[in-house]
Amino acid sequence: ESGYAQNGDLEDAELDDYSFSCYSQLEVNGSQHSLTCAFEDPDVNTTNLEFEICGALVEVKCLSFRKLQEIYFIETKKFLLIGKSNICVKVGGKSLTCKKIDLTTIVKPEAPFDLSVIYREGANDFVVTFNTSHLQKKYVKVLMHDVAYRQEKDENKWMHVNLSSTKLTLLQRNLQPEAMYEIKVRSIPDHYFKGFWSEWSPSYYFRTPEINNSPGEMDP
């Protein structure tokens, strides 16, 4: 968090040691939402440090986080999802640093799953399909997906395709023949909710066939 102190607030520069980031996940466990925060500096001594969220909550003023190793975590139905919450790092009941955050702007979707690739010989293409738990959700239903694929030997040469559906067709002519490919997918909120990319799905590996020139056929 950057910015100038105002009206008695401690200046943010003094509190760089305790800078933290958070992400929310809506309906992550039935109708329960979660909020996860962690210090940006992995070497921060978190002994005696607590996190608390206040404001934009239903029926309660504040909630305390549970500590799970180096992350701080809340699972609750009590997020109002409108307005800004104040998330503070505290020690002995005293706030060290705080951030005003709208939980609808820090949403991290769940990772897509069941990624698979089917080759269609007649169509000379590959149909990529995957699933997302968000199709069943009531809040973060609309996602943008990033499908990334690469030839296994090309370490950092990922090709990316953005799409809003869970199905993609890759044309065989755009891929190298007789090559092993790795493909994976991740998601980000789209429409009202904002936030971060999900984790990547587990990778799927597939091999492209050799070019099969039957008599009278032209090379593509």
Epitope: E1, S2, G3, Y4, A5, Q6, N7, D9, A56, L80, L81, I82, G83, K84, K100, D102, T104, T105, K138, Y139, Y192
Partner: antibody, heavy 118, light 111 residues
Framework: QVQLQQSGAELMRPGASVTLSCKTS????????LHWVKQTPVRGLEWIGG????????AYNQKFKGKAILTSDRSSSTTYMELRSLASEDSAVYYC???????????WGTGTTVTVSS | DIVLTQSPASLAVSLGQRATISCRTS??????????MHWYQQKPGQPPKLLIY???NLESGVPARFSGSGSETDFTLNIHPVEEEDAATYFC?????????FGGGTKLEIK
């Protein structure tokens, strides 16, 4: 308490530009986005755009793109709106307002009356 | 743009009675239980004042005689019992989609 103090009334010639200011106090400037709203008797209240003082990021109503330019100055906790190529239809009361959440407006400035006349 | 239509354009209510103002939107402004509709009060020569956010949440410091309800495309602001100081123009506003738009206003007169 939270206050948004706007600059005084302006009488402008057509074609001119004017910059309105909105000085905030009573809260940490970078914690809340600031927006501008136009009010006329004919068209009522119209959202012009908003700025995030933390990042400088802006969002505009398509209708006001090129007409309004929003900036902010963290050192003085002030946001500004420049209105360009003024015409009679820009005559209005302009409010700066703080966004308490996405995107409702929980604190409003006093308003600045801009009159465009030859 | 999402169009907000308020009705009535004006109404006169006796002191102590109920005032009901409607706001209809041209498309849904709800995402499940998140209703992105807000209500403001404006008195002559003053800026608007936030009364209700998220369709039904009372802004801090606003008297409990103000209440809001509704979902999807139909929203209502209720004032009961109406007091003299409630004479004003009331506006609804949606925030689901940019540009964030306002209703045309409802002028409340106290009889």
């Amino acid at each position: 308490q939270v206050q948004l103090q706007q600059s005084g009334a302006e009488l402008m010639r057509p074609g001119a530009s004017v910059t309105l200011s909105c000085k905030t106090s009573g809260y940490r400037f970078t914690d809340y986005e600031l927006h501008w709203v136009k009010q006329t008797p004919v068209r009522g209240l119209e959202w012009i755009g908003g700025i995030d003082p933390k990042t400088g990021g802006t969002a505009y109503n398509q209708k006001f793109k090129g007409k309004a330019i929003l900036t902010s100055d963290r050192s003085s906790s002030t946001t500004y709106m420049e209105l360009r190529s003024l015409a009679s239809e820009d005559s209005a009361v302009y409010y700066c307002t703080r966004s308490g959440g996405r995107w409702y407006f929980d604190v409003w400035g006093t308003g600045t009356t801009v009159t465009v006349s030859s | 743009d999402i169009v907000l239509t308020q009705s009535p354009a004006s109404l006169a209510v006796s002191l102590g009675q109920r005032a009901t103002i409607s706001c209809r939107t041209s498309e849904s402004v709800s995402i499940h239980l998140l209703h992105l509709m807000h209500w403001y009060q404006q008195k002559p020569g003053q800026p608007p004042k936030l009364l209700i956010y998220g369709a039904s949440n009372l802004e801090s410091g606003v008297p409990a005689r103000f209440s809001g309800s509704g979902s999807e495309t139909d929203f209502t602001l209720n004032i009961h019992p109406v007091e003299e100081e409630d004479a004003a123009t009331y506006f609804c506003q949606q925030s689901i989609k940019d540009p964030y738009t306002f209703g045309g206003g409802t002028k409340l007169e106290i009889k």
